[in-house]
Interface confidence: medium
């Protein structure tokens, strides 16, 4: 807390300037109209004032605004953003995309901070869904947006938005999210031709139901196997020999790589030998010859 | 810690162009980077400052038009750069840099220099 | 533009007080910085904003700022802090920064 102390004789200030760098920090809090500052605000980023300095700065601001800042002067926050709690941030109402442009700008190239992870969560519920330009501009700053948001957050972005985002925006998602994701990117890369909508739907498969990946490996997609194993296990399971053949093409060689680890192992499990076999990779751990295989899920269905 | 490290000693003629660099680890919005220089057996000089997150950057009158600072964040280096070298321009030169925010020593930033680099000797000789 | 005045030279008898003196027009209204340089290394800041101390820089370092003249002062002088000491404040029309003009302490 600066005490309060009156502003020497001349150093009012009558406009925001660099010359405010040398005052000391009772004589910002003295000298400098929180009016003035709140007016001026666009002209503070070009200076280099100290944290310090900063810090008087907002506790202006705070006096003056005491129930949230209006969004003329968030836009112009710049660094004294950096400055800012999430609990000064829960008071503000965002609605303009080009301020939270603005306030991202700032804290570019840092993880993302519990104000700016505040200031997207206050701008977002203002919108009602996460938008295409929202999510377009979430993504550039932070790839990992999308994948920290629960399943139910997810559940509001429409289809239309899913086209923003890029393969790495997805690195860090678990099956549930992507569970959410899938039938969007889905709905949304639904006109698309075979292969331009392999290409585009590829990231979201580990959503992918078992009948959409017996469907794709009608379509010769040639499927990685860095893809493939981020299938989910149960809806892999179900596919034959052939088809998890016809889906990962040549690269269906990779699976022996890979046989000690899910879903891989899990399917290995359920095949016959002499199916795996056929594939001539040297796949062990199928069902051997001349045992009968019972899928109980579907005999308790039918009951 | 901070540390600067600026490039080796350079031995120059008149009227050639030189760039010596002050590299840091880390940066902050609120680093910034002076240029002090020291001819032989003087005092300290201010020539100027730069604060790359404010585009800002100031020299001293007497290096106003003599030298050219600059930096690159991305790579959190300062630099000071000289179109004609001149003999008078013979010194050590150091950089200096304060980092804006609560650290190891105290709450203050870059109009206070608490990281200094090594040193670069330029010498300017026919 | 703003100049610093320090006195060339200070002597002092080990375990005594040396106090060093930084003089000019605009002290009162700015910081004042100061740095320690022994022969053959770069400064070293002991004092901040008038009588801050970093950490690291011993206690028998201390500083004040009043009227137009800002003070360093070393009590217990030791050995060690032999060496030139400069102040630095800031000349306001110019927004650079300035250098006092060294002062060389003598630890007799």
């Known amino acids: 807390e600066v005490e309060k102390t009156a502003c020497p004789s001349g150093k009012k200030a009558r406009e925001i300037d660099e010359s405010l760098i040398f005052y000391k920090k009772w004589e910002l809090e003295a000298c400098v109209d929180a009016a003035l500052l709140a007016t001026q605000m666009d002209r503070v980023n070009a200076i280099p004032f100290t944290y310090e300095q900063l810090d008087v700065l907002k506790h202006k601001l705070d006096e003056l605004y005491p129930q949230g800042y209006p969004e003329s002067v968030i836009q112009h926050l710049g660094y004294l953003f950096l400055k800012m709690s999430p609990e000064d941030i829960r008071k503000w109402n965002v609605t303009s995309l080009e301020t939270l442009k603005a306030l991202l700008e700032v804290n570019k190239g840092h993880e993302m901070s519990p104000q700016v992870a505040t200031l997207i969560d206050r701008f977002v519920k203002g919108r009602g869904q996460l938008d295409k330009d929202t999510l377009d501009t979430l993504t550039a700053f932070y790839p990992g947006y999308l994948c920290s948001l629960s399943p139910e957050e997810l559940s509001s972005v429409p289809p239309s938005s899913i086209w923003a985002v890029r393969p790495q925006d997805l690195d860090t998602c678990d099956p549930r999210q992507l569970d959410v994701l899938y039938p969007k990117a889905r709905l949304a890369f639904q006109n698309m031709n075979g292969s331009e909508y392999f290409v585009k739907i590829q990231s979201f498969l580990g959503g992918a139901p078992t009948e959409d990946l017996k469907a794709l490996s009608q379509q010769n997609v040639s499927m990685d196997l860095a893809t493939f194993m981020k299938l989910r296990t149960d809806a892999v399971l179900p596919l034959t020999v052939a088809e998890v053949q016809k889906l990962l093409g040549p690269h269906v060689e990779g699976l022996k790589a890979e046989e000690r680890h899910r879903p891989v192992r899990d399917w290995i499990l359920r095949q016959r030998q002499d199916d795996l076999d056929t594939l001539g990779l040297g796949l062990q751990g199928g069902i051997p010859n001349g045992y009968l295989v019972l899928d109980l899920s579907m005999q308790e269905a039918l009951s | 810690q901070v540390q600067l490290v600026q490039s080796g000693a350079e031995v120059k003629k008149p009227g050639e162009s030189l760039k010596i660099s002050c590299k840091g680890s880390g940066y902050s919005f609120n680093t910034s980077w002076i240029w002090v220089r020291q001819m032989p057996g003087k005092g300290l000089e201010w020539m100027g400052i730069i604060h790359p997150g404010h585009s800002y950057t100031r020299y001293s009158p007497s290096f106003q038009g003599q030298v050219t600072i600059s930096a690159d964040k991305s790579i959190s280096t300062a630099y000071l750069q000289w179109s004609s070298l001149k003999a008078s321009d013979t010194a050590m030169y150091y950089c200096?840099?304060?980092?804006?925010?609560?650290?190891?020593?105290?709450?203050?930033?870059?109009?206070?220099?608490?990281?200094w680099g090594q040193g670069t000797l330029v010498t300017v000789s026919s | 533009d703003i100049e610093l005045t320090q006195p060339p030279s200070v002597s002092v008898a080990p375990g005594q007080t040396a106090r060093i003196s930084c003089s000019g027009d605009?002290?009162?209204?700015?910081?004042v910085h100061w740095y320690q340089q022994k022969p053959g290394q770069a400064p070293v800041l002991v004092i901040y904003e008038d009588s801050d101390r970093p950490s690291g820089i011993p206690e028998r370092f201390s500083g004040s700022n009043s009227g137009n003249t800002a003070t360093l002062t070393i009590s217990g002088t030791q050995a060690e802090d032999e060496a030139d000491y400069y102040c630095q404040s800031y000349d306001k029309p110019t927004f650079s920064g300035v250098f006092g003009g060294g002062t060389k302490l003598t630890v007799l």
């Open positions: 200096a840099r304060g980092d804006g925010g609560p650290s190891s020593q105290g709450n203050y930033f870059g109009w206070v220099y608490d990281v």
């Open positions: 605009n002290i009162p209204n700015f910081y």
